[in-house]
């Protein structure tokens, strides 16, 4: 099953997020991803946990998953590099770099997104954009077209309260509010974009969606700049 969803969002403007990737398993959407370099897509490590025997590919330039679009192209994956410290039972270090079989053909609908390198928290209340093809309601309806939602960043202390995530949010993670509008499991790997810069990647741990007491959790890319640079080098 696809990992994740956007709840309470709306259809994105077609091709307005040219960095957006669909990580696919055996031809079906599995997770979100974000193009960070011509030949590299950043996603979440947990996305490939159950993909051992399947064919992993990356779809770029898409708005609709099913309809033909001139900018759409499916790339094979040359190499999958999960963060070495990622583990199945934790949300920590939930990052994955996918090297495409060739450099992506760039254009208006396919373009890497600058990512944050300065290791400083995004200010609470900042509105950030998250997008994905995950299911759009609790009944499990899957969208064909890309959805997005704007979410305010939540301070880490609130996110760490016992009734929220009870101390699980390390300095390498960040939270966004989840009051009916939310990302969730299957949008995992997708980008959290603040001020036009990639700040976070949707984690793929299981949690209830759309409940304000269980904020969305995102891996802070700035905290992993050295690792990302070392893989891309």
């Amino acid at each position: 099953p696809p990992r994740g969803r956007i709840l309470g969002g709306r259809e994105a403007e077609a091709h307005a997020r040219p960095y957006m990737a669909s990580v696919q398993l055996n031809g079906a959407h599995l997770c979100g991803g974000v193009l960070v370099a011509e030949q590299w897509v950043l996603s979440a490590a947990h996305c490939l946990e159950d993909a051992a025997d399947g064919k992993v590919q990356v779809l770029l330039g898409a708005h609709s998953l099913s309809q033909p679009e001139p900018s759409k192209r499916l790339y094979d994956v040359l190499r999958a590099v999960p963060h070495p410290d990622s583990q199945p039972d934790t949300i920590d270090h939930d990052l994955l770099l996918l090297q495409l079989s060739e450099k992506a053909t760039l254009g208006p609908a396919v373009r890497p997104l600058p990512w944050q390198r300065v290791d400083r928290d995004v200010a609470p209340g900042t509105l950030c954009d998250v997008a994905g093809w995950g299911i759009v309601n609790h009944a499990g309806r899957r969208p064909d077209s890309l959805q997005h939602v704007l979410l305010p960043v939540l301070d880490r202390a609130t996110c760490n309260r016992r009734t929220h995530h009870d101390g699980a949010i390390t300095e390498r993670l960040m939270c966004a509010e989840s009051n009916r509008r939310d990302s969730c499991k299957g949008d995992s790997g997708g980008p959290l974009v603040c001020g036009g810069v990639l700040e976070g990647v949707v984690t793929s741990g299981s949690r209830v969606c759309g409940n304000r007491k269980k904020p969305g959790i995102y891996t802070r890319v700035a905290s992993y700049a050295a690792w990302i640079d070392s893989v891309l080098a």
Partner: antibody, heavy 116, light 112 residues
Framework: EVQLQQSRPELVKPGASVKIFCKAS????????MNWMRQRHGETLEWIGD????????SYNQKFKDKATLTVDKSSSTASMELRSLTSDDSAVYYC?????????WGQGTLVTVSA | DVLMTQTPLSLPVSLGEQASISCRSS???????????LEWYLQKPGQSPNLLIY???NRFSGVPDRFSGSGSGTDFTLKISRVEAEDLGVYYC?????????FGGGTKLEIK
């Protein structure tokens, strides 16, 4: 190692005020709420209130809203609690405790004795 | 406020025996997010409380597996399978689902 170091015991007169301190170390102070508890001798613990160190926003148990004022100083990673209009009923050990996970980390307690 | 009632007040046990402490809340302590924030703390003489169990049945890191928590709704139990000398002290249940959070009155575990 997470540590919460509380200020020394206080002997105060009835009607006076006292401010007790809780200095945090071993973690990022602004990443966790700080809670305060009271324990009278031989009795259970009572929750006084909590504070978000990011913005200094406190929440109080109604029972203590006219008794306690919670503040933080981010620059020194210190939470503090002022107790006012003290009576002998306020004689107790006062604890700070970090929230997350649960109350896993506590200060050693500050004994406040109210006596003429 | 949610009243947390612990029984017994005092529990004399022999080392190696099982001990069981009950905690009853005056209303359900299932939070609106679906979780139950029932915790158990041990306070040894002259010390601060130590977290043993969170969310009814989860042992905090470093807590021996002889401690186990169970229950739901309004009735909860802490069991110590084989009491050791270091387990002696006052045990408190705590609910964090409703504001204000509240502690039980305590159960003193002592040697018979």
């Amino acid at each position: 190692e997470v540590q919460l170091q509380q200020s020394r015991p206080e002997l105060v007169k009835p009607g006076a005020s006292v401010k007790i301190f809780c200095k945090a170390s071993g973690y990022t102070f602004t990443d966790y709420y700080m809670n305060w508890m009271r324990q009278r001798h031989g009795e259970t613990l009572e929750w006084i209130g909590d504070i978000n160190p990011n913005n200094g926003d406190p929440s109080y148990n109604q029972k203590f809203k006219d008794k306690a004022t919670l503040t933080v100083d981010k620059s020194s990673s210190t939470a503090s609690m002022e107790l006012r209009s003290l009576t002998s009923d306020d004689s107790a050990v006062y604890y700070c405790a970090r929230e997350g996970p649960s109350f896993a980390y506590w200060g050693q307690g500050t004994l406040v004795t109210v006596s003429a | 406020d949610v009243l947390m009632t612990q029984t017994p007040l005092s529990l004399p046990v022999s080392l190696g025996e099982q001990a069981s402490i009950s905690c009853r809340s005056s209303q359900t302590i299932v939070h609106s997010n679906g979780d139950t924030y029932l915790e158990w703390y041990l306070q040894k003489p002259g010390q601060s409380p130590n977290l043993l169990i969170y969310k009814v049945s989860n042992r905090f890191s470093g807590v021996p597996d002889r401690f186990s928590g169970s229950g739901s709704g309004t009735d909860f139990t802490l069991k110590i399978s084989r009491v050791e000398a270091e387990d002696l002290g006052v045990y408190y249940c705590f609910q964090g689902s409703h504001v204000p959070p509240t502690f039980g009155g305590g159960t003193k575990l002592e040697i018979k």
